[in-house]
Amino acid sequence: EVEKTACPSGKKAREIDESLIFYKKWELEACVDAALLATQMDRVNAIPFTYEQLDVLKHKLDELYPQGYPESVIQHLGYLFLKMSPEDIRKWNVTSLETLKALLEVNKGHEMSPQVATLIDRFVKGRGQLDKDTLDTLTAFYPGYLCSLSPEELSSVPPSSIWAVRPQDLDTCDPRQLDVLYPKARLAFQNMNGSEYFVKIQSFLGGAPTEDLKALSQQNVSMDLATFMKLRTDAVLPLTVAEVQKLLGPHVEGLKAEERHRPVRDWILRQRQDDLDTLGLGLQGGIPNGYLVLDLSMQEALS
């Protein structure tokens, strides 16, 4: 078929409207002015263009803006955003949170795509840090977003942004990530009273050191077993039986069901059997009476 490049008489588009869905690809290419498309991008989202037609519209914008689209166009891309590649997005300079929200809305309900990941990366790098409003927005669309960041990236999260984090946002975080987030959370919530503080800090405790757990044990917090099981093993090991009992409160009985799992298993091995017996839970595996426990790590440090 001979390539048709001239726009047929009477078909020149005067506005972006639904009549364009009846155009063939070559007619769209020939009859739609790229500058018109750019100024009326907000209309595209309401019109059911086919994927092939969207390819043509994207091509027209690419020709008009070879160095990357301006934010005025990006904000109104609508579902044409789904046609963008990460390479396209790397050319953009997105500074407005409204633009970010508009594009995240397009992808709502789906897994985070490479396009969205690139968009977020560009946005956050442009801002210099993950401020509270951005974090609020991102975790609203992608609850697992925070845990997809490296510890290095998380270090740019200011403590004030921690207020936007919900417990479910941390579900998939590993200990290295919580190690970074916990001190920020501790700082963010430092002026709260005991019980309110514990409610807020609880989700972050997978990054807490021993001394903070000891301090919590003095505050009648009644930590649940699910939270206890997510604590760092190295932070739990030095806790005494009395401290764990105070930390867990009525939930201490749950230790029996978890005695074969870390960190409970490793903690039991470090406790005197006599002390474990005081709990009345039938926990076994502690250090038998009369045995001397040498902390070899201390000995090495002294020599």
């Epitope: 409207d17 639904e18 059911p48 609508g78």
Partner: nanobody
Framework: QVQLVESGGGLVQPGGSLRLSCVVS????????MAWFRQAPGKGLEAVAS????????IYADFVKGRFTISRDNSKNTLYLQMNSLRPEDTAVYYC?????WGQGTQVTVSS
């Protein structure tokens, strides 16, 4: 999210009629253009008819003018396509679309 579910397709003889329905749920449609598309075996998607939900403007492809009628029932959130004087070349999967959202399609076969 918007869901679109088409129904009403089937086997019909040349010259016969069918009425396709598309029930829309999940979001109000005031801001959308709705349309019927079709895809014949081995061919690309082509627009059949459209209706602008807010203005009521109707547009038809040349190949169905005078034979097909697009309409809507706001109270039922339903889009229709009345197809009369059907021809063998109308055989295709017919899809309903609203903005970026598309249905799964319903098969129309015109054959004697």
């Amino acid at each position: 999210q918007v869901q679109l579910v088409e129904s009403g397709g089937g086997l019909v003889q040349p010259g016969g009629s069918l009425r396709l329905s598309c029930v829309v749920s999940g979001r109000t449609l005031e801001s959308y253009v709705m349309a019927w598309f079709r895809q014949a075996p081995g061919k690309g998607l082509e627009a059949v008819a459209s209706i602008n939900w807010s203005s009521g403007r109707l547009i038809y492809a040349d190949f169905v003018k005078g034979r097909f009628t697009i309409s809507r029932d706001n109270s039922k959130n339903t889009l229709y396509l009345q197809m009369n004087s059907l021809r063998p070349e109308d055989t295709a999967v017919y899809y309903c679309a609203a903005g970026r959202y598309w249905g799964q399609g319903t098969q129309v076969t015109v054959s004697s």
